[in-house]
Interface confidence: low
């Protein structure tokens, strides 16, 4: 058993048929010694008396808010949550496996630049009685500070018969060094509580591996005289790290016909312009990637050819 | 500008070669073994690999003030990785093809380090670990980790040289 926050405790249980459970001793936070009784949740049934209560926690029916009273007055509460371990593996019932980039990916994180700011998100099908708390640090043995905001519901989607809820959180490294080569990973820890079930999820990454620039901005076409060719130009996204002579991007320019089956023409360039042939009804798209480190490409920025 | 008494590197040549290094480091990566060892996690296991750190002056401001600190750090790292790529870790079984990107990477690391330190100019280099000949599982694991770490190192070096070529070239 360990304390998650004031008056909230997590009991770690090996979860298998006829498991013995954990013996837990609760102590009433009071100077009083006599006449103390204990109840669970809204029930008025007295579970025991005295300053301490010893219980055997085996299942969710044994978890909940234990309250000690004296003469009708509430003295203190202890909320017990359960953390299940089945076959040596902690349960992951609350969050959905996003399966990208690999199985057992519950948290996904992205950064738009090297400033030390990043966003993480996760999915669940649970709509109520759900709370999240996020902590982060750089390294784990001698952790350096990362400040995370509160997790918020960022999207709702319908997937077949189910509703899926996306939560996200923004974090900022306290003393980021954008130009340095990271040697210690960022650690993100999410505590999830659904009713009386506690679970925790972690992710470990280098900012360089989660970089995904915003799409190029101000994408423009300029027809070239007496030619089917056009000059495509664009700019670095505003959110990208500066100076651009240091934090450089590379770009992919694609000409795509109306039909998905039509052959795509692709050009790769480090410049912020390119000359391509504009076919009728086609569109031109440009995306960006860090020039020196193969992290994710940005989403496409597109303009029609006509 | 470089410090008085310190010479400026051939920024443009360094830029071209460091960008080539980035490409090679990424093309070599899938060839390190038949397994994706990212499962190992990039835990804090980087004790003996040189990193370009915050105080090394490799940021745009530090380069403007005195690029020599940063260039020395990059040179140390290049020599370190060049030695590792020439060691039993990469030459032993399971053997890589002679024309693999690892061989080109090895040659390019040497080339860039020589551009940074012409004859007769000596910076002290970091001690290279001496590893006994190792087994395939050890080599495959180390190849993967070393190349992952090299990708990050050469990315910072390439940024330094790109910025230098754009803003510090005579």
């Amino acid at each position: 058993i360990w304390e998650l926050k004031k008056d909230v405790y997590v009991v770690e249980l090996d979860w298998y048929p006829d498991a013995p459970g954990e013996m837990v001793v609760l102590t009433c936070d009071t100077p009083e010694e006599d006449g103390i009784t204990w109840t669970l949740d809204q029930s008025s049934e007295v579970l025991g008396s005295g300053k301490t209560l010893t219980i055997q926690v085996k299942e969710f029916g044994d978890a909940g808010q234990y309250t000690c009273h004296k003469g009708g007055e509430v003295l203190s509460h202890s909320l017990l949550l359960l953390h299940k371990k089945e076959d040596g593996i902690w349960s992951t019932d609350i969050l959905k496996d996003q399966k990208e980039p690999k199985n057992k990916t519950f948290l996904r994180c992205e950064a738009k630049n090297y400033s030390g700011r990043f966003t993480c998100w996760w999915l669940t099908t649970i709509s109520t009685d759900l709370t999240f708390s996020v902590k982060s640090s750089r390294g784990s043995s001698d952790p350096q500070g990362v400040t995370c905001g509160a997790a918020t519901l960022s999207a709702e989607r319908v997937r077949g018969d189910n509703k899926e809820y996306e939560y996200s959180v923004e974090c900022q490294e306290d003393s980021a060094c954008p130009a340095a080569e990271e040697s210690l990973p960022i650690e993100v820890m999410v505590d999830a509580v659904h009713k009386l079930k506690y679970e925790n999820y972690t992710s470990s990454f280098f900012i360089r591996d989660i970089i995904k620039p915003d799409p190029p901005k101000n994408l423009q076409l300029k027809p070239l005289k007496n030619s089917r060719q056009v000059e495509v130009s664009w700019e670095y996204p505003d959110t990208w790290s500066t100076p651009h002579s240091y934090f450089s991007l590379t770009f992919c320019v694609q000409v795509q016909g109306k039909s998905k089956r039509e052959k795509k023409d692709r050009v790769f360039t480090d410049k912020t312009s390119a000359t391509v042939i504009c076919r009728k009804n086609a569109s031109i798209s440009v995306r960006a990637q860090d020039r020196y480190y193969s992290s994710s490409w940005s989403e496409w920025a597109s303009v029609p050819c006509s | 500008r470089a410090v008085p008494g310190g010479s400026s590197p051939a920024w443009t040549q360094c830029q071209q070669l460091s960008q080539k290094l980035c490409t090679l480091a990424w093309s070599a990566h899938p060839l390190v073994g038949h397994m994706d060892l990212r499962e190992e996690g990039d835990e804090e296991t980087t004790n003996d690999v040189p990193h370009i750190q915050c105080g090394d002056g490799c940021d745009p401001q530090g380069l403007r003030d005195n690029s020599q600190f940063c260039l020395q750090r990059i040179h140390q790292g290049l020599i370190f990785y060049e030695k590792l790529l020439g060691s039993d870790i990469f030459t032993g079984e399971p053997s890589l093809l002679p024309d693999s990107p690892v061989a080109q990477l090895h040659a390019s690391l040497l080339g860039l380090s020589q551009l940074l330190q012409p004859e007769g100019h000596h910076w002290e280099t970091q001690q290279i670990p001496s590893l006994s000949p190792s087994q395939p599982w050890q080599r495959l694991l180390l190849r993967f980790k070393i190349l992952r770490s090299l990708q990050a190192f050469v990315a910072v070096a390439a940024r330094v040289f790109a910025h230098g070529a754009a803003t510090l070239s005579p």
Epitope: - | T45, P136, W137
Partner: antibody
Framework: QVELVQSGAEVKKPGSSVKVSCKAS????????ISWVRQAPGQGLEWMGG????????NYAQKFQGRVTITADESTSTAYMELSSLRSEDTAVYYC??????????WGQGTLVTVSS | DIVLTQSPATLSLSPGERATLSCRAS???????LAWYQQKPGQAPRLLIY???SRATGVPARFSGSGSGTDFTLTISSLEPEDFAVYYC?????????FGQGTKVEIK
């Protein structure tokens, strides 16, 4: 002459963890790998994983992935193997061995871990 | 993972006789990275042969290893009383190293 000395026998409850140590003396600890091999009573040898102390890099057998953690402390020339969520079938003698190109040439004396409720 | 199958499971011989132990791999062992170990009751294994045929330091000449690819053999030319033990083959030519199940050489 390299010698590997392991920690003493352990008795553990199901669901708990055990951490076995392996201290090297008489050689350069960092220059080779340390592997961990276990042997259940009356059974054969089973490789669990290994570590290269100089780099701290570990490699684990698929069967133990997620349950075993192998670490090394260069300052004390000691390697550690921690096995979590113990079950009765983890009762075995656990050996550390110096793992070089010539196979496992130096072995610890073994540590008996008994898992029983 | 490469599976190593040792045969026979038990070999009953008398001192002075020749012992031939076989180890077959489910796929070719890279670089013939195959070792043989001897284990006596209550003791840690001892390395005898590495690289399929090289004798480890201090191992008597009566022990020899041969074979390549998927078929390997440990031969004890003339059994001494101290040679009665369990013998394991071990491949270390892949990212996941594996052992055979062992052959027990017992006194007939």
């Amino acid at each position: 002459q390299v010698e590997l000395v392991q920690s003493g026998a352990e008795v553990k409850k199901p669901g708990s963890s055990v951490k076995v140590s392996c201290k090297a003396s008489g050689g350069t600890f960092s220059n080779y790998a340390i592997s961990w091999v276990r042997q259940a009573p009356g059974q054969g040898l089973e490789w669990m994983g290994g570590i290269i102390p100089m780099f701290g890099y570990a490699n684990y057998a698929q069967k133990f992935q997620g349950r075993v953690t192998i670490t090394a402390d260069e300052s004390t020339s000691t390697a550690y193997m921690e096995l979590s969520s113990l079950r009765s079938e983890d009762t075995a003698v656990y050996y550390c061995a110096r793992d070089i190109y010539a196979g496992m040439d130096v072995w610890g004396q073994g540590t008996l871990v008994t898992v029983s409720s | 993972d490469i599976v190593l199958t040792q045969s026979p499971a038990t070999l009953s011989l008398s001192p002075g006789e020749r012992a031939t132990l076989s180890c077959r791999a489910s796929q070719s062992v890279l670089g013939n990275y195959l070792a043989w170990y001897q284990q006596k009751p209550g003791q840690a294994p001892r390395l005898l042969i590495y690289g399929a045929s090289s004798r480890a330091t201090g191992v008597p000449a009566r022990f020899s290893g041969s074979g390549s690819g998927t078929d390997f053999t440990l031969t004890i030319s003339s059994l001494e009383p101290e040679d009665f033990a369990v013998y394991y083959c071990h491949q270390y030519g892949s990212i996941s190293t594996t052992f055979g199940q062992g052959t027990k050489v017992e006194i007939k």
